[in-house]
């Protein structure tokens, strides 16, 4: 066939509204004169004496030109049928990346503009290297590699086994039959880290203490607990119908609220963040509710908190003691403002 096959379904050719469009008769030899008709219409659009050979030229195509065309050879034989579809070349996709743990991240994208044409995305990434490798061949360990697209979630790819301290460049290229357009994004896991909210939040009264509530929770399931990468927590609580939250930063995985309003139900929620302040705070957990005990005041410490100090100590020791000090996070040496950015 003299017609180059654009990416997309067979038999379809593509053009841009407002531009000149050339349709190509697929079943003839290049340059052979043909006649062109709209499918189902007897009127000749372009005769074999046009001097355009096997091509039909539509000046300033618009939506009325979309549809199926038929080309015929000089002897009346069918040269082929062509469907014209109009749309736009890709614009640079908008890309963002996020991480819910310290060794994997995902990137999502959306089209910069709707092209109206069949579209696919090519996704890849590489580890950025420090300058100064004049004498060294680039290591295969820096990539590039494909960023595998999520079969269940369109417009998302996932990088597994990323290094927390490295910087990666993501390449998302939108491809359609009229061209391709690329967006690049540089990401550091430590900057895009946002844990999932803590799970299993429970709020319980403390028998004999009408102003106390005991809240406990667990790490999010997506955060593989490992001594080098701990989470810290922020807890908020408020009595029912009260507009303002009180905030505390607990140590470990529980907190005793000591200034609850007696007799009133309280909403409690908790959020998590890398313990060295990498990235941002998670979303808040779903609220849990609890009402302080209404029983008589007790002088004695209730059983559950007997040795509460040791329990907390044990949690902290278990999580903190094996952790070698991570280097403090350096501020990103990035633009101080966004004047005159280089267009991607």
């Amino acid at each position: 066939s003299p017609c180059p096959q654009a990416w997309g379904p067979p038999g379809v050719q593509y053009g841009q509204p407002g531009r000149s469009v050339k349709l190509c008769c697929p079943g003839v030899t290049a340059g052979d004169p043909v006649s062109w008709f709209r499918d189902g219409e007897p009127k000749l659009l372009q005769g074999p004496d046009s001097g355009l050979g096997h091509e039909l030229v539509l000046a300033q195509a618009d939506s009325t030109d979309e549809g199926t065309y038929i080309c015929q050879t000089l002897d009346g034989a069918l040269g082929g049928t062509v469907t014209l579809q109009l749309g736009f070349p890709p614009a640079r996709p908008e890309v963002s990346c996020q991480a819910v743990d310290y060794e994997n991240f995902s990137c999502t994208w959306s089209p910069g503009q709707v092209s109206g044409l069949p579209t696919r995305y090519l996704t890849s990434y590489r580890k950025k290297t420090l300058p100064g490798a004049e004498s060294q061949r680039e290591s295969p360990s820096t990539g590039p590699w494909p960023c595998p697209q999520d079969p269940l979630e369109a417009s998302r790819c996932v990088v597994h086994g990323a290094e927390f301290w490295s910087e990666y460049r993501i390449n998302v290229t939108e491809v359609n039959p009229l061209g391709a357009s690329t967006s690049l994004l540089d990401v550091r896991l430590q900057s895009i880290l946002r844990p999932d909210p803590p799970q299993g939040l429970r709020v319980e009264s403390v028998p004999g203490y009408p102003r106390r509530l005991h809240a406990s929770w667990t790490y999010p399931a997506s955060w593989r607990r490992q001594p080098h990468f701990l989470l810290k927590f922020r807890l908020q609580y408020r009595p029912a119908q009260h507009p303002a939250w009180s905030t505390v930063e607990p140590i470990g995985l529980e907190e005793v609220i000591t200034d609850a309003v007696a007799g009133l139900p309280h909403a409690v929620r908790v959020s998590a963040r890398d313990f060295l302040d990498a990235g941002t705070w998670s979303a808040w957990s779903p609220e849990a509710w609890g009402t302080p005990s209404t029983g008589p005041l007790q002088d004695e410490i209730p059983d559950w908190s007997q040795g509460h100090g040791q329990q907390l100590e044990a949690v902290v020791a278990q999580e903190d003691s094996p952790a070698p000090a991570r280097p403090s996070l350096q501020p990103d040496p990035r633009p101080l403002d966004h004047r005159d950015p280089l267009e991607q």
């Epitope: 950025k128 100064g132 460049r169 005159d340």
Partner: antibody
Framework: EVQLLESGGGLVQPGGSLRLSCAAS????????MGWVRQAPGKGLEWVSY????????GYADSVKGRFTISRDNSKNTLYLQMHSLRAEDTAVYYC???????????????????WGQGTMVTVSS | QSALTQPPSASGSPGQSVAISCTGT?????????VSWYQQHPGKAPKLLIY???KRPSGVPDRFSGSKAGNTASLTVSGLQAEDEADYYC???????????FGTGTKVTVLG
């Protein structure tokens, strides 16, 4: 070895044209910003032109805008500089250079040229 | 696209320190942390010494250091050695071409 090798320089008359090439090896060329920097005899460095990794965006110094065109062929790991309407003041050593750049969600920024070629001399004279 | 301003020359004896300034505007040096420094020996291609204001590429001795205050960046060469005699250029992102601009260059002479 990470390397850039320029070629295509030479003697050309004022108003003439020349095409410089820069062959890259030892790194994934298609992922890097590339640029041309020139240095007139006995003078300082002057930024000439740059190109985005995919080739989709380019930029030029005012002194060459409209006369020079930068392009790249990622399948051949080669950077080009097509120069038209050459003037005596375009006489210089032309260096090809690599930049990793930095890309935020809104824009890309040139950072630093970490790899340089050895340069090719362009002389514009009658 | 005005070049960044550097002193034409600087000198020092072996073992001493020399500092080179690079003055731009809030649209280039002052507006971004993309300031780099290059060393160029006669007849050779430039070599990257400092990038992103303060960072040293692998293989560059720690005698070379960079800093920035406002619209002025500085390169300091401490413990001067004979091989440090060269031309030094600063560069910054943010010229009016949205790409980069070089400094006027400073010739460093190692005395004695």
């Amino acid at each position: 070895e990470v390397q850039l090798l320029e070629s295509g320089g030479g003697l050309v008359q004022p108003g003439g044209s020349l095409r410089l090439s820069c062959a890259a090896s030892g790194f994934t060329f298609s992922w890097y910003f590339m640029g041309w920097v020139r240095q007139a005899p006995g003078k300082g460095l002057e930024w000439v032109s740059y190109i985005y990794p995919s080739g989709g965006s380019t930029g030029y110094a005012d002194s060459v805008k409209g006369r020079f065109t930068i392009s790249r062929d990622n399948s051949k790991n080669t950077l080009y500089l097509q120069m038209h309407s050459l003037r005596a003041e375009d006489t210089a050593v032309y260096y090809c250079a690599r930049d990793e750049g930095y890309c935020s969600s809104t824009s890309c920024y040139f950072d630093a040229f970490d790899i340089w070629g050895q340069g090719t001399m362009v002389t514009v004279s009658s | 696209q005005s070049a960044l301003t550097q002193p034409p020359s600087a000198s020092g004896s072996p073992g001493q320190s020399v500092a080179i300034s690079c003055t731009g505007t809030s649209s280039d040096v002052g507006g971004y942390n993309f300031v780099s420094w290059y060393q160029q020996h006669p007849g050779k291609a430039p070599k990257l010494l400092i990038y992103e204001v303060t960072k040293r590429p692998s293989g560059v001795p720690d005698r070379f250091s960079g800093s920035k205050a406002g619209n002025t960046a500085s390169l300091t060469v401490s413990g001067l050695q004979a091989e440090d005699e060269a031309d030094y250029y600063c560069s910054s992102y943010g010229g009016s071409n949205n790409a980069g601009v070089f400094g006027t260059g400073t010739k460093v002479t190692v005395l004695g």
